[in-house]
Structures are given as structure tokens and as C-alpha cells.
Interface confidence: medium
């Protein structure tokens, strides 16, 4: 899997899970959120080259033609398969909210 | 939605539907398929700039993140939404299959 | 206008790198293809390698290996990283877009068009 | 690696007069017509002329005209205008993973 475990500890150009540190308030302007101050979000970057973790037949399909076809401009890109939510404290006037943001962090990528 | 009717019409940039005829001999070199020759296998291309079609909570950060961090590499990537399947007529020496080949035909764009 | 304009050439010494720069206006580098060709002084035109819209990049035989293509989007620029410069890396480089024709990316039939002007490179010591 | 050899490499013609260039490929472009042509001025860039081995780019005048296909092209300005003394290349795009693009050597029209 293109998770963590992998991407962490090897150098990989190709698709894998890169690890990207949000801060709420300096990096989307969020004021709002109370706790935590940032989190590890992660994100999807690299290669797709033919058969390097295809999600579909389609990406297989785009992948082999992509290899083939000198204009190569149809590819196959890495987005993340695995997400889980995030826990946030935030106040509504002085009452505070423990909520759980869906699809937050990324743990694992493919090509699609 | 992203799909033929909107990005087929419209000369548009940002994530949308191309289309992409693949022709599985010439293209693939696939030369086990009887029937089609080819399909229109059609393709996902395109800038994601914020809130353009995101398809989670996770992407909407990441597109938001890029617009306050435009140095930064990490950007949703604009991939498949829904895919249907192709059906194809192949032969085992003589005897004729047919056959669905499942997401093989993408429909509609996402920004993940 | 669609407009592609190289910088960052300049003399280098063998052995040497340079990181060559393509700067894009009028269109999206996340729907283009962009192509890097040189052409040595008096000589003819030398595909190096380009960078499809998705981030995957391609080189010739030649290049593999020394050259390196990469882009920011965001900030709307292709590189040409070259590594190991020989003096028969002299040349102009030039940057070229995949025209696009019938509303997609792909199908320009190897036509590159607009090119930027072009950015001398001098390896010399 | 495929090879495109252009000839004449120079092409002595007066105004007015009809110029064929060729361009012979070592194996086929892909789909028989990636083949492209530009022209040259000195201190220029390059200048798209035809792309699939016949279709005239826009602004073109029509005097220009290129036919052929699979590995034999040819480029023709059926009358030779002052502004058209230049150097011509033809380019081919193929399959395969490596090597998708090659330029011929060019061919020079030069005034008698």
C-alpha cells in the first residue's frame, strides 16, 4: 500500500503518500478552530506509470496508453484512496463543540 | 456535474471530462479483442482551483491550502468519478466470449 | 495571448548544471504538455523530453539520465535541470507547447506550438 | 531510436517556383500521420506549418501543402514567395516509452 509505512521511509518519484503539515490559522486562514492549531493532513504526488498501484481498469487503460502514445498527455493521477477524519474543538460564542471533520487526513494514495 | 454534457460544450481549463477515443491494437497493442475495434474511453484533465468540484473535505483544504501557499506542490489532481463498463466480444481459439470489462469508460471529473 | 519565455541559460563550465526556466501565461500547465528542444549553433532541432499536464515526464535515450524535467504549476513555470554539461551541450533551448486540437490534450499529431524564444547555453571553460 | 532524414539538405530555387522537401522516417510515425512541419528563420524559433501530415495550422497561407504517410512526407509550397526562404524541419512522433519525438536534419531553401 502507498501508505506511510512505505512512502515514509523509501524515496519513491512515483505516486505515494507525502507527509504535509497544515496549520489551520497560518496555512488556510482558519480562525475558528480552537484545537487543535494544525494537523498532519498528508497528500498524494508523484509518477503513475503503467501499473504502479491503478485504481480502475481505466487507469490501467490510460497508464498503458500513456506508455505508448507519443502525445501522452492523457495520464493516470495520484489521489488519495485512504482518509480519516480529524477531531476538532471550536467555540460557538463560549460554548465549546468537539467535532469530527470527515475525510481530513490522508493515509494511503493511487493512481486514478 | 463534470461530464460530457457540460465540458464537451465548453471550453474550460479546469477539471473536466476530455475526450479520448482508444483504439486497442494501434493504441493498447491489444490484439485480443475481436469487438470493438476501439472505444471512447474519454479522460480527466485540468486545473483544481478552490472548491472546483471537490470531492472531499480533504481536497477542499488541499485546493485552499495551494491558494494561500502557491509555491506549494501539493494540489488536488482532477481524476474519474464515475465510470461505467465496455462490453467485448474476444475468442478462446475458436470459441467466441463475451464479456464486461468493468470502469473502463469515465463519465463524469472530480477534483481529489 | 499563450505565451512560453525561457530564462537561465548562460556559461557554465564543463562538468557543470544549470537549471533552465519556462515561464507560461495564457494557459493552464495542469491541461498542456510542455516540450524542451535544443539546437546546437548552425545545427538542426533536438527533442530533449516534455512534461505531460499530469506530471509525468519522458526524455529521449539521450537525455535520460542528465536531464531532468519538472514543473511548478502554481507558479506556472517548466525546468530543465542538466547535470554533467559536455561542450556539445552548447546550444539554444528552447520550450514548446503541445497545440491542442479538438478540445482535449491529446491528438496534436506532434505539433509543437507556441515556442518561446529561447535561452543560449555556452559550456566552456 | 527512429531516425527522420529530410532531403535535399538545401534547395536552390528562385521566386516563384514550385519546392518539394522530403522526409523519410526509419519506421512508422505514430498512427502513420504524427508528422509535423516548421519552418525556420534565422534568430527565430521554430514556426508550425502542418501537423498530422496534411493539416495546415491556422494562418498558414495555402500555398504550403504536406502529404504522405507511415514512414514518406513531403512538404510543398506550390509557389515560392520571398518570405518563404528558410530552413524546414520535419518532426514525427512514435511509440514506445522512450524517444516519443524526432526532428529531421532540415532542409535549406535557399534564393538562386
Known amino acids: 500500500a502507498l501508505d506511510a509505512a512505505y512512502c515514509f521511509r523509501n524515496v519513491q518519484d512515483n505516486c505515494c503518500l507525502r507527509p504535509l503539515y497544515i496549520d489551520f490559522k497560518r496555512d488556510l486562514g482558519w480562525k475558528w478552530i480552537h484545537e487543535p492549531k494544525g494537523y498532519n493532513a498528508n497528500f498524494c504526488a508523484g509518477a503513475c506509470p503503467y501499473l504502479w498501484s491503478s485504481d480502475t481498469q481505466h487507469s490501467r487503460v490510460l497508464s498503458l496508453y500513456n506508455t505508448i502514445n507519443p502525445e501522452a498527455s492523457a495520464s493516470p493521477c495520484c489521489v488519495s484512496q485512504d482518509l480519516e477524519p480529524l477531531t476538532i474543538l471550536y467555540y460557538i460564542g463560549k460554548t465549546p463543540k468537539i467535532e469530527q471533520l470527515s475525510n481530513m487526513i490522508v493515509k494511503s494514495c493511487k493512481c486514478s | 456535474a463534470l461530464d460530457a454534457a457540460y465540458c464537451f460544450r465548453n471550453v474550460q481549463d479546469n477539471c473536466c471530462l476530455r475526450p479520448l477515443y482508444i483504439d486497442f491494437k494501434r493504441d493498447l497493442g491489444w490484439k485480443w479483442i475481436h469487438e470493438p475495434k476501439g472505444y471512447n474511453a474519454n479522460f480527466c484533465a485540468g486545473a483544481c482551483p478552490y472548491l472546483w468540484s471537490s470531492d472531499t473535505q480533504h481536497s477542499r483544504v488541499l485546493s485552499l491550502y495551494n491558494t494561500i501557499n502557491p509555491e506549494a506542490s501539493a494540489s488536488p489532481c482532477c481524476v474519474s468519478q464515475d465510470l461505467e463498463p465496455l462490453t467485448i466480444l474476444y475468442y478462446i481459439g475458436k470459441t467466441p466470449k463475451i464479456e464486461q470489462l468493468s470502469n473502463m469508460i469515465v463519465k463524469s471529473c472530480k477534483c481529489s | 495571448e499563450q505565451q512560453l519565455v525561457e530564462s537561465g541559460g548562460g556559461l557554465v563550465q564543463p562538468g557543470g548544471s544549470l537549471r533552465l526556466s519556462c515561464a507560461v501565461s495564457?494557459?493552464?500547465?495542469?491541461?498542456?504538455?510542455v516540450n524542451w528542444v535544443r539546437q546546437a549553433p548552425g545545427k538542426g532541432l533536438e527533442w530533449i523530453g516534455y512534461?505531460?499536464?499530469?506530471?509525468?515526464?519522458y526524455y529521449a535515450s539521450w537525455a535520460n539520465g542528465r536531464f531532468t524535467i519538472s514543473k511548478d504549476s502554481a507558479k506556472n513555470s517548466v525546468y530543465l535541470q542538466m547535470n554533467s554539461l559536455r561542450a556539445e551541450d552548447t546550444a539554444v533551448y528552447f520550450c514548446a507547447r503541445h497545440m491542442q486540437v479538438g478540445g482535449a490534450p491529446t491528438g496534436s499529431m506532434a505539433a509543437f506550438d507556441p515556442w518561446g524564444p529561447g535561452t543560449l547555453v555556452t559550456v566552456s571553460s | 531510436e527512429a531516425v527522420l532524414t529530410q532531403s535535399p539538405g538545401t534547395l536552390s530555387l528562385s521566386p516563384g517556383e514550385r519546392a518539394t522537401l522530403s522526409c523519410q522516417s526509419s519506421q512508422s510515425v505514430y498512427n502513420n500521420n504524427y508528422l509535423s512541419w516548421f519552418q525556420q528563420k534565422p534568430g527565430q524559433p521554430p514556426r508550425l506549418l502542418i501537423y498530422g501530415a496534411s493539416t495546415l495550422t491556422s494562418g498558414v497561407p495555402d500555398r504550403f501543402s504536406g502529404s504522405g504517410s507511415g514512414t514518406d512526407f513531403t512538404l510543398t509550397i506550390s509557389r515560392l514567395e520571398p518570405e518563404d526562404f528558410a530552413v524546414y524541419y520535419c518532426?514525427?512522433?512514435?511509440?514506445?516509452?522512450?524517444?516519443?519525438?524526432?526532428f529531421g536534419g532540415g532542409t535549406k531553401v535557399e534564393i538562386k
Open positions: 512534461i505531460s499536464y499530469g506530471g509525468s515526464a
Open positions: 495564457g494557459f493552464s500547465l495542469s491541461s498542456y504538455t
Open positions: 518532426a514525427g512522433g512514435y511509440s514506445g516509452s522512450s524517444d516519443k519525438y524526432a
